[in-house]
């Protein structure tokens, strides 16, 4: 007996071929001998089966001796043995219909679990193998689970169901809801405008929720909420903002915050959380601000950085086009009695300059000028 695998909701064509290449009488029946469809001359006739409105055939193929049974919008319960009667012969086809669905929504927060459930007809013993967009294979029976979803798990999951050495493939689109970056760092000179961007790693037609940016300044003993906002159909509206600093927020996605001035007292770490409507849990992105200040007080030229810097970062003071006078893995460096000229304060990581501030040192009888 021929075995055909079908997918729930799909359309399947069960073939039946006569030796004569012409239109002759045929009937399709189910295992209970209930007529599904057949022909009377050129007319398609239908029986009292449950498939009535979902069963069809192709008149144009009858003249070729082909008498297909086409079943639309397949259901698991359509799994059955179908019998084609033509030319005093009986052709049996076993149809097995499977369904594969994600347990919950196919839009899941980063870190959540994905469970795929296989619907199968009674008596079947299928095996399932799924391949994630990043190439990870998982195997199982009626259910497959993936815990701790990552951003790379977003995309099309391809699942193959094997039964009777036949296979049917399912494609499920999974969207992992997350920010593009888990963490970002912004380096600014004192007084510069600061732009924080929080791009999302997904696109959906309607995006509604609420968010907040909590800030832990390096100089402060506790964190404080800098801004709260609402998101409605991708439109951003500010609910509450602190007076110091007075952040500004863009009205459209991606989420965008502007700090008018980078000041040492603002240097630190922030955590932007976004709670999406109808989702349990929140999206998070960490943001860090490092602020640099270069000053000359009397005979002392000082360069300082505030904020979360890694121990491997190097802070240097050098006269333009000359070797560094001082270079340390510290958050402050200074030069006593600096000679006149344009001095550069550099924050670098393995030779790559992250932040630079210039200060002009005038001959000792005049005051310094900061460009």
């Amino acid at each position: 007996k021929k075995v055909v695998l079908g997918k729930k909701g799909d359309t399947v064509e069960l073939t039946c071929t006569a030796s004569q290449k012409k239109s002759i009488q045929f009937h399709w029946k189910n295992s209970n001998q209930i007529k599904i469809l057949g022909n009377q001359g050129s007319f398609l006739t239908k029986g009292p089966s449950k498939l009535n409105d979902r069963a069809d055939s192709r008149r144009s193929l009858w003249d070729q001796g082909n008498f297909p049974l086409i079943i639309k919008n397949l259901k698991i319960e359509d799994s059955d043995t179908y019998i084609c009667e033509v030319e005093d012969q009986k052709e049996e086809v076993q149809l097995l219909v499977f369904g594969l669905t994600a347990n919950s929504d196919t839009h899941l927060l980063q870190g959540q679990s994905l469970t795929l459930t296989l619907e199968s007809p009674p008596g079947s013993s299928p095996s399932v193998q799924c391949r994630s967009p990043r190439g990870k294979n998982i195997q199982g029976g009626k259910t497959l689970s993936v815990s701790q979803l990552e951003l790379q798990d977003s995309g099309t999951w391809t699942c193959t169901v094997l039964q009777n050495q036949k296979k049917v493939e399912f494609k499920i689109d999974i969207v992992v809801l997350a920010f593009q970056k888990a963490s970002s760092i912004v380096y600014k000179k004192e007084g510069e405008q600061v732009e924080f961007s929080f791009p999302l790693a997904f696109t959906v037609e309607k995006l509604t929720g609420s968010g907040e940016l909590w800030w832990q300044a390096e100089r402060a003993s506790s964190s404080k909420s800098w801004i709260t906002f609402d998101l409605k159909n991708k439109e951003v509206s500010v609910k509450r903002v602190t007076q110091d600093p007075k952040l500004q927020m863009g009205k459209k996605l991606p989420l965008h915050l502007t700090l008018p001035q980078a000041l040492p007292q603002y240097a630190g770490s922030g955590n932007l959380t976004l709670a999406l409507e109808a989702k349990t849990g929140k999206l998070h992105q960490e943001v860090n601000l490092v602020v640099m200040r270069a000053t000359q007080l009397q005979k002392n030229l000082t360069c300082e950085v505030w904020g979360p810097t890694s121990p491997k970062l190097m802070l240097s003071l050098k006269l333009e086009n000359k070797e560094a006078k001082v270079s340390k893995r510290e958050k402050a460096v200074w030069v006593l009695n600096p000679e006149a000229g344009m001095w550069q304060c550099l924050l670098s990581d393995s030779g790559q300059v992250l932040l630079e501030s210039n200060i002009k040192v005038l001959p000792t009888w005049s005051t310094p000028v900061q460009p």
């Epitope: 799909d10 399947v12 001359g41 050129s42 192709r58 008149r59 144009s60």
Partner: antibody
């Protein structure tokens, strides 16, 4: 809801090969046949041929010698190639899903054959 | 090949009118006939299949009848959006063939 999106070269020279592709989105690919139909300017509709997911084809005898329809089930796409085109092949070409009736249809692609 | 002949080739009518278009097959096609509506720059749209079954989403003012070789498409009360070209198509045998079309114009 099933949608068909088609594309291909719109301007050809006589004797060249016409090549069009149709992608099927949002529905079953197996179980149906996938057709190409054309409509020359100011004329009626002409069925070119069809294919199913397993590659079984039926062609209009009037075009059979020049037509090849192929399928790529991994992408839910099917393609039309019509060789040795002449000005008489200038038409809007449509792809469509069919069991017995054509529904839905692609948006159509105007192919002009001119030297 | 089965030839499909539509009549008239064009018809002028007003909003609210009842319009009938006929289609004749060169041989018996039982009920293997469909009707399509085609507007300029758009894809044809299936209206009626199996000679008399109304396609889902199509207004009930459209109806089809006939069997064998003679078929009709009737629009009971013309609406402004109905002005288009109408085609019949046989699905009885390969190659599938269409009528030459009936252009329905505003009077």
């Amino acid at each position: 809801q099933v949608q068909l999106q088609q594309w291909g070269a719109g301007l050809l020279k006589p004797s060249e090969t016409l090549s069009l592709t149709c992608a099927v989105y949002g529905g079953s690919f197996s179980g149906y046949y996938w057709s190409w139909i054309r409509q020359p300017p100011g004329k009626g509709l002409e069925w070119i041929g069809e294919i199913n997911h397993s590659g079984s084809t039926n062609y209009n005898p009037s075009l059979k010698s020049r037509v090849t329809i192929s399928v790529d089930t991994s992408k839910n796409q099917f393609s039309l190639k019509l060789s040795s085109v002449t000005a008489a092949d200038t038409a809007v070409y449509y792809c469509a899903r069919v069991i017995n009736w054509f529904d839905p249809w692609g948006q159509g692609t105007l192919v002009t054959v001119s030297s | 090949d089965i030839q499909m002949t539509q009549s008239p080739s064009s018809v002028s009518a007003s909003v609210g009118d009842r319009v009938t278009i006929t289609c004749r097959a060169s041989q018996d096609i039982s009920s293997w006939l469909a009707w399509y509506q085609h507007k300029p720059g758009k894809a044809p749209k299936l209206l009626i299949y199996a000679a008399s079954s109304l396609q889902s989403g199509v207004p009930s003012r459209f109806s089809g009848s006939g069997s064998g070789t003679d078929f009709t498409l009737t629009i009971s009360s013309l609406q402004p959006e109905d002005f288009a070209t109408y085609y019949c198509q046989q699905a009885n045998s390969f190659p599938y063939t269409f009528g030459q079309g009936t252009k329905l114009e505003i009077k």
